[in-house]
Amino acid sequence: HLYPGEVCPGMDIRNNLTRLHELENCSVIEGHLQILLMFKTRPEDFRDLSFPKLIMITDYLLLFRVYGLESLKDLFPNLTVIRGSRLFFNYALVIFEMVHLKELGLYNLMNITRGSVRIEKNNELCYLATIDWSRILDSVEDNYIVLNKDDNEECGDICPGTAKGKTNCPATVINGQFVERCWTHSHCQKVCPTICKSHGCTAEGLCCHSECLGNCSQPDDPTKCVACRNFYLDGRCVETCPPPYYHFQDWRCVNFSFCQDLHHKCKNSRRQGCHQYVIHNNKCIPECPSGYTMNSSNLLCTPCLGPCPKVCHLLEGEKTIDSVTSAQELRGCTVINGSLIINIRGGNNLAAELEANLGLIEEISGYLKIRRSYALVSLSFFRKLRLIRGETLEIGNYSFYALDNQNLRQLWDWSKHNLTITQGKLFFHYNPKLCLSEIHKMEEVSGTKGRQERNDIALKTNGDQASCENELLKFSYIRTSFDKILLRWEPYWPPDFRDLLGFMLFYKEAPYQNVTEFDGQDACGSNSWTVVDIDPPLRSNDPKSQNHPGWLMRGLKPWTQYAIFVKTLVTFSDERRTYGAKSDIIYVQTDATNPSVPLDPISVSNSSSQIILKWKPPSDPNGNITHYLVFWERQAEDSELFELDYCLKGLKLPSRTWSPPFESEDSQKHNQSEYEDSAGECCSCPKTDSQILKELEESSFRKTFEDYLHNVVFVPRKTSSGTGAEDPRPS
């Protein structure tokens, strides 16, 4: 009963339905299933298509622009589990721009183990409000279900039996509303007793064995599960794989020869991107983790003595890193056999991504070229780079080459970083924010001092737009209140005091004291500092009575730690020597103050002598809240209440239904509009700044997701005519 068909690899089915038949005998898709970009399909094309054997997808299910598909109830009638081992942008189920889809209909879907659900822009899609997602996955709050027909209240979702006045389906509470749960007009949502947890239950409601996941045909029997909570071995669900078996892909047990076959298949094939599987911690995994290397006799990962070398040989001797994706191809490499060219114009979360993928590189056999990388602020993402051999050099005999990097301000933090360049010269031109002092420091540290010729390091085009400080500014006075910080610092004057144009004060919220000026920044980033320009103080001739420059920072958040530093702004001197000074980063916390009022107080009387009062914490605690004060006062009774005859025929039932405390924002909006209509004279309030900000964030989040979707989904046609897993994927 358990997984009756085959285990199939992940599939990307696009353009037409021909490849869909590859799903025919699949019980498990080990990977993801993407069905997308079918513009010529019609409803009748899907009529006789059904894959009843499919029970589990280990990664994610993505449906995008498949025309004519109206329901998934016949396509995947027995899909029970989506494990979400690997997710699509944090989602395990994505239904996006499915123009004809009327209902999901995945009536056997019982568990999404990891990740959440994104159902967006499906303008015919109903039966969404009738699904209790909390019975299927844990992180319901991360679901993103918007811009579907269901949003417009145009859906007449009718669960089985409703038409005959019966309630056949289980009802559960969401947002205080007790609603019948169903997937379609003929399929209830199966709601097991909560005591069964995610193990599932039989049709009669008895809990499955604790090793089951989602469903079973008999209770208390690990061989009668529909899917396994942990691992599958020989027709049985088990908690862990016993020797001589190994855990594979987070869901099944395999023996040594299975893992060995995978290893050799990849080793012997010329296919790029396949994995030479290895054994580590009782698992058969694609590669040894960081710090381990493979013992070729038994495929076991053994700890490296010292750092593990992972030599990456570059095709054609060099590789251009122009995106995070190309950087990912070097993930885990410690030695680069060849040369690297960094040419990064933009991207998302760049510094962190580059460090994650290039941060282990210790050695480059050829040269390193940083060219027109407008997005880079620092090279500190090359966290472990210690050696550039220069065995092959860039034209002109350069082993380190930096050209036209508009925002590059720091190479490395030379107090913490050592770099040796065995042979070859340095080249620096058109790096306007990179101070010459930084370049000269690199010459000293890397051992290249004296190798450079006159024009290798341009004096006019490096650091010409930077404030290149060489003195330390010290803060002399700091005072705080709940929303202000008053700062003063020691005066600084360059040799010609007229060169001092003023000071720049940089600050930002910093919950942790780990902020640096450049780390984690990129020129496209949003983690920038707030900058205040401050005029220089009046200059006194008496050095003892010099005014200390300063600034009163206003409008700060109470009880918040700020990172602050200050630097000088000086004119560019003709002698090509720019003076300046900069402080260390300091951390200052504003004082606490009164919290804002507690939100949404709701009072409900649950008996003749009790009132239950609930509220939400204030939006701005402005400190550590230790307690709340509750005041009450007895009110005089309204005499009308006693005099009214409650049996009067004319009395109408209250028209407003009672809504429970803390209902969702959506239902609050709905109530609001009702009142506005009835009043007739009221207009809706203008949106608050926080509402506007929230909407902007939401819109930006939507765009990010769409960009991600398009980048993943639309791929150029391959010229080779591969088959199977290597099928050309037209866009």
Epitope: P170, V173, P193, T194, C207, S210, P219, D220
Partner: antibody, heavy 116, light 107 residues
Amino acid sequence: EIQLQQSGPVLVKPGASVKMSCKAAGYTFTDSYMNWVKQSHGKSLEWIGDINPYNGGTSYNQHFKGKATLTVDKSSSTAYMELNSLTSEDSAVYYCARRRGAMDYWGQGTSVTVSS
Amino acid sequence: DVQITQSPSYLAASPGETITINCRASKSISKYLAWYQEKPGKTNKLLIYSGSTLQSGIPSRFSGSGSGTDFTLTISSLEPEDFAMYYCQQHNEYPLTFGAGTKLELK
């Protein structure tokens, strides 16, 4: 045939502890949860908690947390319940019963009398 | 916790009659209610679970109905061996809770 055989009646002094057993036969012991239920004299039934013999995981009724401890010995297919700091309130018949939720097989009960 | 109110506490009937026992839950428990029979000197017997599913080996004169908060056990054409104590129990959520019981006596 499925059977749950419970240990015999006990008389204990207040403040003492007692550990009773429930030996299972006729099915795979590790496949079904074991429940424990209290029935005070002339009163209804009260669920104490359950244990999953497969992995030792337990769920307790809040009223019995700290009072009852559930354990199993897989090798002998036996479930145990220990009651500590006994008072006269703990005098009752204690049943073990198989299966999570709707309990399909019950033991004959162990009578515990707490008296000085 | 889900409170279960069972009624009546006592019920006298004669063989051949049909009787009903009711249980009401303090909140919805879907269909997840079980019925047990308790007889002196015998182990407790599961009769019905999930509101209406008959446990194997139980005669078909026993039937259950209801969902949400209101449930009923019906015994049609009573047999002499049916005179016993009956309990209902919700098996939807922890902690599992029982009704106070109904004593079915011979009239």
